[in-house]
Interface confidence: low
């Protein structure tokens, strides 16, 4: 209840997160024209990426373009990119949709299609659908520890969500353990009324809200966080508006003294931690 006699002040907060969990990924691997099942283990270093601010990212799906090298090659024949002669290709042109700089030549992409030749990381990335089901769908069972330190400078009061008395093997539950700050990712989605398996395919943005409603009067002191969850990206966006959440990154290596890279289009969940609240004192 609002205590009108109290002097209220907004919370100042810092957040630190740690994600834990291991995923086993099974995918088709093509080597020398032979496709076989490949198994790999993903740990925290493989699926999480440092983000600025109060956010962390967990990769749940990916598309790889392996063995790319900087050279000349035909660009991917996306819609509107095909050509029949060199006139369609403009030397030095950088089409924002393309992956490189055009050389001015129209060259065969495959037996039936021709596209403009580009100077780029080749072969250029194909426009592939995100695998379904998601490759790291087991990320549902990963956990994240959220450390939240808060401060009310006007009241000279500091606290944190983690107390020394808390049990390190707990898992957050809104009824049974609402003060535990280790969250199972699947539970976060369930609480928000979302299907993790579905969102994991294209990615998305999930908000973790930490609300501090602090009464700092010594006779009725209370200052503990309340957690709630909601999806922040627009899940109903039309396909043409690029649904979900993804970005690209590359792993570089040398082969026979030639620099190569594996390009990875990573789909996943960006978790934004939103801390708000007030501290009141007489």
């Amino acid at each position: 209840s609002d205590k009108l006699y109290q002097r209220k002040e907004p919370v100042i907060s810092s957040v630190h997160t740690k994600v834990k969990g291991i995923a086993e990924v099974t995918e088709n691997v093509t080597e020398g024209g032979v496709t076989k099942l490949g198994h790999s283990i993903f740990d925290t270093a493989d699926y999480t990426f440092p983000l600025q601010g109060n956010s962390f990212f967990v990769m749940t799906n990916y598309v790889k373009s392996e063995g790319q090298v900087q050279t000349l090659c035909p660009e991917y024949p996306r819609r509107g990119a095909q050509c029949s002669s060199d006139r369609r290709c403009k030397k030095g042109w950088m089409d924002p949709q393309s992956k490189g700089i055009q050389t001015g030549r129209c060259v065969p992409y495959d037996k039936t299609r021709k596209t403009c030749e580009v100077s780029a990381w080749c072969p250029t990335e194909e426009e592939k659908e995100a695998p379904r089901p998601a490759l790291l769908r087991s990320a549902e069972n990963f956990t994240v520890l959220i450390k939240n330190n808060i401060h009310f400078p006007g009241h000279n009061y500091t606290t944190r969500n983690i107390l020394p008395t808390m049990n390190g093997s707990c898992t957050f539950h809104k009824t049974w353990d609402p003060q535990c700050s280790i969250f199972r990712l699947g539970d976060i989605f369930q609480e928000a009324g979302e299907n993790f398996t579905e969102v994991a395919v294209q990615g998305g943005i999930m908000g973790i809200e930490i609300y501090w409603d602090c009464n700092l009067d010594s006779w009725s002191h209370h200052c503990r966080p309340r957690y709630s969850f909601r999806r922040l990206d627009d899940k109903n966006t039309d396909e043409s508006f690029v649904p979900g959440y993804n970005f690209r990154y590359a792993k570089y290596y040398k082969e026979n003294n030639v620099e190569k890279r594996t390009l990875i289009k990573a789909f996943g969940i960006r978790f934004d931690i939103l801390v708000f609240g007030t501290g009141g004192k007489f």
């Epitope: 740690k18 520890l145 330190n149 983690i162 020394p164 049990n167 390190g168």
Partner: nanobody
Framework: EVQLVESGGGLVQAGGSLRVSCAAS???????MGWFRQAPGKEREFVST????????VYADSVKGRFTISRDNAKDTVYLQMNSLKPEDTAVYYC?????????????????WGQGTQVTVSS
């Protein structure tokens, strides 16, 4: 990368004392440090922790009044003085370090771990 090395473990009679040390390979003055232990067939459990400046200490109920945690930041070393030892204190004692400066009883909170030192209390 911080390496933690425990020493000082051994065999002692019930009622006796022992001091275990934890030396860090790098500067840990801004870290909180903790001790955990694991008895045979049991899960690793919290023993004690100390904040970066030594101002805050926390002890498990089972060791309160008998064990004392301390640190020497100039030597990047943490100590656990164990008095009035009991047979149930028998375990491998692990030193742990957290880059956060405040104390925590959570294993989840500690980034760096030592290999452990065996403490055996005979009756």
């Amino acid at each position: 990368e911080v390496q933690l090395v425990e020493s000082g473990g051994g065999l002692v009679q019930a009622g006796g004392s022992l001091r275990v040390s934890c030396a860090a390979s790098a500067r840990t003055g801004s870290y909180s440090m903790g001790w955990f232990r694991q008895a045979p067939g049991k899960e690793r459990e919290f023993v004690s922790t100390i904040s970066w400046n030594g101002a805050d200490t926390v002890y498990a109920d089972s060791v309160k009044g008998r064990f004392t945690i301390s640190r020497d930041n100039a030597k990047d070393t943490v100590y656990l003085q164990m008095n009035s030892l009991k047979p149930e204190d028998t375990a491998v004692y692990y030193c742990a370090g957290s880059i956060t400066s405040y104390v925590s009883t959570w294993q989840h909170d500690y980034e760096y771990w030592g290999q452990g030192t065996q403490v055996t209390v005979s009756s």
